[in-house]
Each structure stands twice: as C-alpha cells, then as structure tokens.
Interface confidence: low
C-alpha cells in the first residue's frame, strides 16, 4: 500500500440549511482509472464512515440513493457536498482517497475539514 497526499480545507461553515461543501484534492502518482472516495467523520475519537463512492475517471461520482453526500470530480479534485447536517453533526470530516485500479494501490487520507453546523434560530414569533 503506497501513500498519497490528500489536501482539503481546514474549516468549512455549513449553510443555514445544513449544507457543507468542500474540495478534496489528491496528488495522483499515476494514471488511475478507478478511484474510491470515502468521507469519514471523527468526533470524540470515534471514526465513522459518512459516505463513499467509486468512480471511473471522467465519470460522475455515484453515491448511494439514500446517501447524504453528492459530488463531482474534475481531474484530481473531488467536490464534495454533505447535506442534512445539524449542530450535532459538527466535527472533523476526513477525506480518504484510494486509487483502486490499476495497481499499485495508493491510499491517501487528508487531515480533515472541521465542519461547523449552527442550527437555525427559531423565528421570533414562533412558540419555541
């Protein structure tokens, strides 16, 4: 397993609608045709997988139908969008990139993007 550098922004603030977008860029050492991108969330020393997608270079990323992630790829950059975020989802979101094919296999893990999610304030005239 060979190491590969992955860059991602340090901090991103989610929109008031709970949507956060960031770019995950990897330094591909060769011409990969199949790439796997995984978003991991680290909070309280627990790491959980948020979503993952495999894509062929030049094609769109395909996440599960019920995934909270969407994304597009352009060269060695992946534009990731995570939606449906709440304040409790604030945490470090790590981008993991694997060059699945052809060999050799490369693995790169970014330092993570701290996503801050602020729940919207209730309307002044609401009952809350």
């Amino acid at each position: 397993c060979k190491a590969m550098h992955v860059a991602q922004p340090a901090v991103v603030l989610a929109s008031s609608r709970g949507i956060a977008s960031f770019v995950c860029e990897y330094a591909s050492p060769g011409k990969a045709t199949e790439v796997r991108v995984t978003v991991l969330r680290q909070a309280d020393s627990q790491v959980t997988e948020v979503c993952a997608a495999t894509y062929m270079m030049g094609n769109e990323l395909t996440f599960l139908d019920d995934s909270i992630c969407t994304g597009t790829s352009s060269g060695n950059q992946v534009n990731l969008t995570i939606q449906g975020l709440r304040a409790m989802d604030t945490g470090l979101y790590i981008c993991k990139v694997e060059l699945m094919y052809p060999p050799p296999y490369y693995l790169g893990i970014g330092n993570g993007t701290q996503i801050y999610v602020i729940d919207p304030e209730p309307c002044p005239d609401s009952d809350f």
Epitope: C1, T38, A52, A53, T54, P103, L107
Partner: antibody, heavy 124, light 110 residues
C-alpha cells in the same frame, strides 16, 4: 479462530421477505468488507452484493437491485442480508464471505473466509 | 451481466495435471488483474485457492497455480489427488465494487 456463523434455515412463502444473519469472530470485523453470495440447488455461485467496513457504502448486483438490502452491526460483529418479494427461484443457500481487501489499504481481492451457508426455501 | 464462462467438466487420473479455463470480457477478467479461484466440495462452503490472478493464500498447496492472459484465466492442478474432486469457480472483480463468478467446473478424479 476466524469464522463466520450464519443463522439457521428458513422456509418462506412467495412474496415474503427473509433476513439472514452472519456473525463474525476471531478477527477485527470493523476493518473488512463483507460479501453475500448465493447458490441455487445444483447451480453455481452468484454474487449478490458487498458492504463496506462501517456500512456507509453498499453495492448490489444489478439483478438484485431494489430487492436486497445488506446491513451490518459493528457492536455485535454481525452482517445481515434481507431479500424481499421472494419467489421460488430464490430458493438457494446464501453465504456470507469476508473480502481480503481491508479498509486500511491493500491490493488483495479474494473471499478468504466463508460462512457455513443458510438454506432459504421459498414455497407456497 | 452473465456469469464468466467455464468448461463444464474436466477429468484426470491421480498424479496427472489438469487445467480449468475461465473466459470473461473486457470489463471484468481482461480489465482487472483480480481473478480469484475457489474449490467447493459437495454440501460444503467454497474455499479460496487463488487470489489476485495467481497468489496462493497460506495453507493452500503449491499444486495449485493460476495464470491470466487477456480475457481468459486458467487454474492448473498438478499431481491430481482424490480430494481434488470438487467444483471449481473463478471470480473476477468487475469494476464499481462489483464481482462476477464463473458458472463452475466439475472436476472428476478417475
């Protein structure tokens, strides 16, 4: 030792659903992808789907899309396969299998540990 | 996506060598160097014999060897033994996190 132990045989009516479990022991379950493969009586092996180490990603064979759901519970080291809208041709032995490819990285693809199989019979 | 094509049956005498073939397409066997081979005795679970085209897991006899060229993979068993009588299946990675098995080959030791 490393093993996968599956739930017992099931008899179901057409149109029903079945959920088969596969409990892992002897290895670090959260690090491995898990497959489901089936084998109809007297037939060959047929790949159904795979689930990633923490369950965030699943891929199913086109033939089973919309009918199969693979899930896993890391707390009990168990992976599940649920097949809905059963028909007689779904009568088969269903196997879970561990993928050698480990999420910490590696270039080894092969199903190196298999469960004992679960016979699902669909009959009216 | 239909199964990979395997010879339906093959037979040999003890001590002989036999070869099982597995033919795929340019989107599975030919596209990826990720063919694995399994042996299955009647009413038993399959056992991994070969992975990544030619590698043997620890504990598998060196009588088993494999090779891939283009869209065809082959498994050779040398020094045939009675316990080799079983079904043999090839399997290939097919991209996008999907796999495909061969239809299976029945080996008879005469």
């Amino acid at each position: 030792q490393v093993q996968l132990v599956q739930s017992g045989a099931e008899v179901k009516k057409p149109g029903a659903s079945v959920k088969v479990s596969c409990k892992a022991s002897g290895f670090s379950f959260p690090n491995y992808y898990m497959h489901w493969v089936r084998q109809a009586p007297g037939q060959g092996l047929e790949w159904m789907g795979i689930i990633s180490p923490t369950g965030g990603s699943r891929t199913y064979a086109q033939k089973f899309q919309g009918r199969v759901t693979i899930t896993r519970d890391t707390s009990t080291s168990t992976v599940y396969m649920e097949l809905s809208s059963l028909r007689s041709e779904d009568t088969a032995v269903y196997y879970c299998a561990r993928e050698m490819y480990n999420w910490n990285g590696g270039w080894d693809y092969g199903m190196d540990v298999w469960g004992q199989g679960t016979l699902v019979t669909v009959s009216s | 996506q239909s199964a990979l094509t395997q010879s339906a049956s093959v037979s040999g005498f003890p001590g002989q060598s036999i070869t099982v073939s597995c033919v795929g397409t340019n989107s599975d066997v030919e596209a990826y160097d990720l063919v694995s081979w399994y042996r299955q005795h009647p009413d038993k679970s399959p056992n991994l014999l070969i992975y990544d085209n030619y590698k043997r897991p620890s504990g598998v006899s060196d009588r088993f060897s494999a090779f891939k060229s283009g869209n065809t993979a082959s498994l050779t068993i040398s020094g045939l033994q009675a316990e080799d009588e079983a079904y043999y299946y090839c399997c290939s990675y097919a991209g996008f996190s999907t796999w495909i098995f061969g239809a299976g080959t029945q080996l008879t030791v005469l």
